[in-house]
């Protein structure tokens, strides 16, 4: 690797460093589909942005392979714990890759927020945050799932969100 | 942009990379003012530091525009749920910018930790963590607010804190 | 520092930037020792990796001094709140340094998840996340501790984990 080659690589690195991949997607009314699919997100307006990553059907799509810190927060809330709602809520970040038909768990949390409400008419709130570093290849996708998504509370994009940046 | 220009930019970038903006501020006895203002923070002692960011009256002040991962954790605690205390606690990161005198919500969580205590004399603890990537212009400020701040428990700067770094 | 020197430093920086220190360690059946020591972690299989950091007896070991965003999540769970189990769970990141015999608290959370269960036979789940920027010198170590670790629930490395990356 001669000086010229190194120079080109450095120039290239400077340019790529300017767009270190990062994204922050926010919750919206359309986030909860009720279809059993992943949560959907606002990608452009408000606090949301995509820089060096793309988006498709709820998924952050990696364009540049590397290690990424991925994170998600969801705001949970309800009134008491109605029958038919799971007492355990699972919030997770999952990877979709062309090499496997099934989603792979990356980071997952289980919580029992309903149990906080001591009466059936008590309003309760809880929040679940996940974050961690994972390796992602170009073309791989990351999605957020919440089971039971009926307990996710959306407002103004600041309480439920999903993001990533290359480390 | 000739080689000399590129060289200067690369030298500049190397120098600026050495001080990628970052900060970690810690809770102290003076953090809770009771004035309705944001939480105040220790900026120098112990684990606290500022690197490429400044601080003013509870706010991290941005000196270099860019995308920042901002985060905060607060330690909550109490004995039962005394009357007069909100059953919902709101913990948020907010932006201040001169053009908009009202703070802008960036990342927010609501929790109902009191509900965990099954008797009025039961001691309870809970923790709220927020983190996400936002764009900040030079001169803009980020603050942390907790409502009701009377439930924030401070001890030695490790349980309640506030930080940021450029991504 | 002449051009040649700057060039060497830039080449060096480019190479080191390629391996910006990062790690993500995952929970495994062997994580909980019951010995009073820190949690142990998987470092290679599955989602776990080490890049520019090393590992020893539960600790991430720093090889390059700098500011690091360190994080950990633990999945907690149980059935009711059996006598003998602490009603408060402490989850923390601690630093070991040759200069001090005792571990130094870096980031800590206290939670009372048991209180969510309204009956003694109720299954409950909770999750604790910590993350923040700290300065670490070469040779210093970071560990995770949970008290009472009997409430930590391990499964497939996605629910309890520990990581870091240089900022």
């Amino acid at each position: 690797d001669g000086p010229a080659g190194s120079w080109e690589q450095l120039i290239q690195e400077r340019r790529s460093h300017e767009v270190n991949p990062a994204a922050h997607l926010t919750g919206a009314n359309s986030s909860l589909t009720g279809s059993g699919g992943p949560l959907l997100w606002e990608t452009q307006l408000g606090l949301a942005f995509l820089r060096g990553l793309s988006y498709h059907d709820g998924a952050l799509v990696v364009t540049k392979a590397g290690y990424y810190y991925i994170y998600s927060k969801v705001q949970l809330g309800g009134v008491g714990c109605p029958l038919g709602l799971a007492s355990t809520i699972t919030h997770g970040l999952y990877k979709r890759t062309p090499r496997y038909p099934e989603e792979l768990e990356l980071l997952v949390s289980q919580q029992s927020p309903c149990g906080r409400a001591t009466s059936s008419s008590r309003v309760w709130w809880d929040s679940s945050f996940l974050g961690g570093v994972v390796h992602l290849e170009a073309g791989e996708k990351v999605v957020v799932r919440v089971l039971d998504e009926r307990l996710v509370r959306l407002r103004d994009g600041t309480r439920s969100y999903f993001g990533a940046f290359m480390v | 942009d000739g080689p000399a220009g590129s060289w200067e930019q690369l030298i500049q970038e190397r120098r600026s990379h050495e001080v990628n903006p970052a900060a970690h501020l810690t809770g102290a006895n003076s953090s809770l003012t009771g004035s309705g203002g944001p939480l105040l923070w220790e900026t120098q002692l112990g684990l606290a530091f500022l690197r490429g960011l400044s601080y003013h009256d509870g706010a991290l002040v941005v000196t270099k525009a860019g995308y920042y991962y901002i985060y905060s954790k607060v330690q909550l605690g109490g004995v039962g749920c005394p009357l007069g205390l909100a059953s919902t606690i709101t913990h948020g990161l907010y932006k201040r910018t001169p053009r908009y005198p009202e703070e802008l919500e960036l990342l927010v969580s609501q929790q109902s930790p009191c509900g965990r205590a099954t008797s009025s004399s039961r001691v309870w603890w809970d923790s709220s963590f927020l983190g996400g990537v936002v764009h900040l212009e030079a001169g803009e400020k980020v603050v942390v607010r907790v409502l009701d701040e009377r439930l924030v428990r401070l001890r030695d700067g490790t349980r309640s804190y506030f930080g940021a770094f450029m991504v | 520092d002449g051009p040649a020197g700057s060039w060497e430093q830039l080449i060096q920086e480019r190479r080191s930037h390629e391996v910006n220190p990062a790690a993500h360690l995952t929970g495994a059946n062997s994580s909980l020792t019951g010995s009073g020591g820190p949690l142990l972690w998987e470092t290679q299989l599955g989602l776990a990796f080490l890049r520019g950091l090393s590992y020893h007896d539960g600790a991430l070991v720093v090889t390059k001094a700098g500011y690091y965003y360190i994080y950990s999540k633990v999945q907690l769970g149980g059935v009711g709140c059996p006598l003998g189990l602490a009603s408060t769970i402490t989850h923390g990141l601690y630093k070991r340094t040759p200069r001090y015999p005792e571990e130094l608290e870096l980031l800590v959370s206290q939670q009372s998840p048991c209180g969510r269960a309204t009956s003694s036979s109720r299954v409950w789940w909770d999750s604790s996340f910590l993350g923040g920027v700290v300065h670490l010198e070469a040779g210093e170590k970071v560990v995770v501790r949970v008290l009472d670790e009997r409430l930590v629930r391990l499964r497939d490395g996605t629910r309890s984990y520990f990581g870091a990356f240089m900022v």
């Epitope: 919206a28 606002e42 995509l50 | - | -």
Partner: antibody
Framework: QVQLVQSGAEVKKPGASVKVSCRAS????????MHWVRQAPGQRLEWMGW????????KYSQKFQGRVTITRDTSASTAYMELSGLRSEDTAVYYC??????????WGQGTLVTVSS | QSALTQPASVSGSPGQSITISCTGT?????????VSWYQQHPGKAPKLMIY???KRPSGVSNRFSGSKSGNTASLTISGLQAEDEADYYC??????????FGGGTKLTVL
């Protein structure tokens, strides 16, 4: 301070195209969306579309889909709106406006485009 | 996306208060606290008056206030002055990266 300065008035013939520019200053150009809004004489404001200046993504109002193209030159901190197949009803003042969170602020001063044979 | 519904015109005498309504759906006005209001004098560019339903940018008189109930947002101007005579437009985020304007209201100060 934050400012948007648009190009001058244009007179075009039916069927022609017009390209209006909007130069930004006082903020990080690539970190915000830029919208284009038009207003025909005596009519309401009409949203045309936006461009994500950072990555070039665009979204257009269905009404203008296929006729409008929004681009940007990041090195010049300038956004452009090109409208083709001009008709007399396209006579309007065209505004650029920065998207700040979920509102428009500031706005350009406006560019009058007159379509006349 | 159809326009938000505003009255075509409202009027009031100096010193009075007037309210301009802006009705949408649960997908836009009702779904988010992201309603803003713009004032436009003849031949001038629109000016932001209210954002996030009820917040005022610096430099805007506190005679201007905003509120929302259900799918309807409102702009209230108290202590009406001659210089308030202008067109007023509401605007809302509508999800999925889309936005929508109101039809505009002409305010006449009698």
């Amino acid at each position: 301070q934050v400012q948007l300065v648009q190009s001058g008035a244009e007179v075009k013939k039916p069927g022609a195209s017009v390209k209006v520019s909007c130069r930004a200053s006082g903020y990080t150009f690539t970190s915000y969306l830029m919208h284009w809004v038009r207003q025909a004489p005596g009519q309401r404001l009409e949203w045309m579309g936006w461009i994500n200046v950072g990555n070039g993504n665009t979204k257009y109002s269905q009404k203008f889909q296929g006729r409008v193209t929004i681009t940007r030159d990041t090195s010049a901190s300038t956004a452009y709106m090109e409208l083709s197949g001009l008709r007399s009803e396209d006579t309007a003042v065209y505004y650029c406006a920065r998207n700040y969170y979920n509102w428009f602020d500031p706005w350009g001063q406006g560019t009058l485009v007159t379509v006349s044979s | 996306q159809s326009a938000l519904t505003q009255p075509a015109s409202v009027s009031g005498s100096p010193g009075q208060s007037i309210t301009i309504s802006c009705t949408g759906t649960s997908s836009d006005v009702g779904g988010y606290n992201y309603v803003s209001w713009y004032q436009q004098h003849p031949g001038k560019a629109p000016k932001l008056m209210i954002y996030d339903v009820s917040k005022r940018p610096s430099g805007v008189s506190n005679r201007f206030s905003g509120s929302k109930s259900g799918n309807t947002a409102s702009l209230t101007i108290s202590g009406l002055q001659a210089e308030d005579e202008a067109d007023y437009y509401c605007f809302s985020y509508a999800g999925s990266s889309t936005v929508v304007f109101g039809g505009g209201t002409k305010l006449t100060v009698l």
